[in-house]
């Protein structure tokens, strides 16, 4: 995502427009405590990170509070006083929405409506994936709000569902991340189940009259 600068790989994730995580992977500096310096305004002095991420005892990233910001993050990763990598990025283009909350299922015959709490910002897609043990892969449906109706389900089958949120690529660009998936929930005949059988149960033989 960040390309290679002096052998440094950069990754930026803006968690739910709340916290920015910048991580680096620098093979050349693998046993070095690189420092992270940042500012949100090109005219200000750099501040040093106060919340480092560590990997094998060495700095590997920084977490920054950045509530609802859509401006530029200027940052410099340094080895002592020597800048190893300096850059500026529009933070919002690295958005990772939070996982869906309060997921609910409303059944009506062969259809289910999946709802959850909409996030406070827009230009998102709410994706529901579902499958039964008879399906070889997940089916998917997505909407602009967390109100997704899936029709044509077989009331006798057990279905597994999970939900995630994605940033619209035509709005936020190619570098966003989908949210983590919600927990899998299983349903059959409109009732929640602990799990769906991994192998489909064979249909019951019809009793001859």
């Amino acid at each position: 995502q960040g390309g290679a600068a002096e052998g440094v790989q950069i990754q930026i994730i803006y968690f739910n427009l709340e916290t920015v995580q910048v991580t680096w992977n620098a093979s050349k500096y693998s046993r070095t405590n690189l420092t992270f310096h940042y500012r949100f305004n090109g005219d200000e002095a750099y501040d040093q990170c106060t919340n480092y991420l560590l990997q094998e005892g060495h700095t590997s990233g920084c977490l920054l509070d950045a509530e609802q910001r859509d401006d530029i993050l200027y940052f410099s990763i340094r080895n002592g006083t020597h800048p190893v990598f300096t850059a500026s990025r529009w933070m919002v283009y690295y958005l990772k929405p939070s996982s869906p909350k309060h997921v609910r299922f409303s059944w009506h015959q062969d259809a289910v409506t999946v709802t959850c709490s909409d996030l406070s910002y827009g230009d998102l897609l709410y994706e529901v994936q579902y499958r039964s043990p008879f399906d070889t892969e997940w089916q998917s449906k997505q909407e602009n709000t967390c109100n997704v109706t899936i029709e044509g389900l077989d009331a006798e089958k057990c279905y597994s569902f999970w939900v995630r949120v994605k940033a619209m690529e035509d709005v936020y660009g190619p570098d966003t991340y989908p949210s983590d998936w919600s927990e899998v929930t299983c349903w059959q005949r409109g009732e929640i189940r602990d799990a769906c059988a991994e192998t489909p149960t064979p249909p019951k033989p019809k009793l001859s009259k």
Epitope: Q1, G3, A4, A5, R69, W90, P174
Partner: antibody, heavy 118, light 107 residues
Framework: EVQLLESGGGLVQPGGSLRLSCAAS????????MHWVRQAPGKGLKWVSS????????YYADSVKGRFTISRDNPKNTLYLQMNSLRAEDTAVYYC???????????WGQGTLVTVSS | DIQMTQSPSSLSASVGDRVTITCRAS??????LAWFQQKPGKAPKSLIY???SLQSGVPSKFSGSGSGTDFTLTISSLQPEDFATYYC?????????FGQGTKVEIK
């Protein structure tokens, strides 16, 4: 289809003011950072100013800082550049440009000519 | 500010030629480099971003490469519509800066 249409250019005397507008369509304007880039006659491209999607973050080239103000009206899908204390060296075609994240300056308007001369 | 230097400033080529333009940054810009094409009296058009990725709708005869400080734009087989001025731009670090341009003319 993304469209950016600049207007407001013209002839102005040194020390005068001008306000450029850019009408945007075909994309979610409120979520996109936007830029102004200029090109003096027969010369190369120079970045002038940028604004974040919300309008909260604004950025300027040193040559225009304190004289130019970038702003946006998201309900109207319009970007502005207020230019004060204009100088002869501000004479250029001014382009409105959409930001595309790692895709960079991905869409450009056709430009509007500003001439500063007495 | 980061200085971007293009070479050559101009070149003459024939239809069908393979053309290479180079761009050098005054400091490491990772792969945050774009290439633009501009025809006389027209707005610049984005061709390539992050050094080697083609913008949507741009023909595959255009290709870019490089990382760090040295970058190239290649046109594999020059066509009449490709005669124009080409600019590189770094957008790794604000302010974004452009090269001075390379004018590709008909031989």
């Amino acid at each position: 289809e993304v469209q950016l249409l600049e207007s407001g250019g013209g002839l102005v005397q040194p020390g005068g003011s001008l306000r450029l507008s850019c009408a945007a369509s075909g994309f979610t304007f409120r979520s996109s950072a936007m830029h102004w880039v200029r090109q003096a006659p027969g010369k190369g491209l120079k970045w002038v100013s940028s604004v974040s999607g919300s309008g909260a973050g604004t950025y300027y080239a040193d040559s225009v800082k304190g004289r130019f103000t970038i702003s946006r009206d998201n309900p109207k899908n319009t970007l502005y550049l207020q230019m004060n204390s204009l100088r002869a060296e501000d004479t250029a075609v001014y382009y409105c440009v959409k930001e595309g994240g790692s895709r960079g300056f991905d869409y450009w308007g056709q430009g509007t000519l500003v001439t500063v001369s007495s | 500010d980061i200085q971007m230097t293009q070479s050559p400033s101009s070149l003459s080529a024939s239809v069908g030629d393979r053309v290479t333009i180079t761009c050098r940054a005054s400091q490491d810009i990772s792969n945050y480099l774009a290439w633009f094409q501009q025809k006389p009296g027209k707005a610049p058009k984005s061709l390539i971003y992050t050094a080697s990725s083609l913008q949507s709708g741009v023909p595959s005869k255009f290709s870019g490469s490089g990382s760090g400080t040295d970058f190239t734009l290649t046109i594999s087989s020059l066509q009449p519509e490709d005669f124009a001025t080409y600019y590189c731009q770094q957008y790794n670090l604000y302010p974004p800066t452009f090269g001075q341009g390379t004018k590709v003319e008909i031989k």
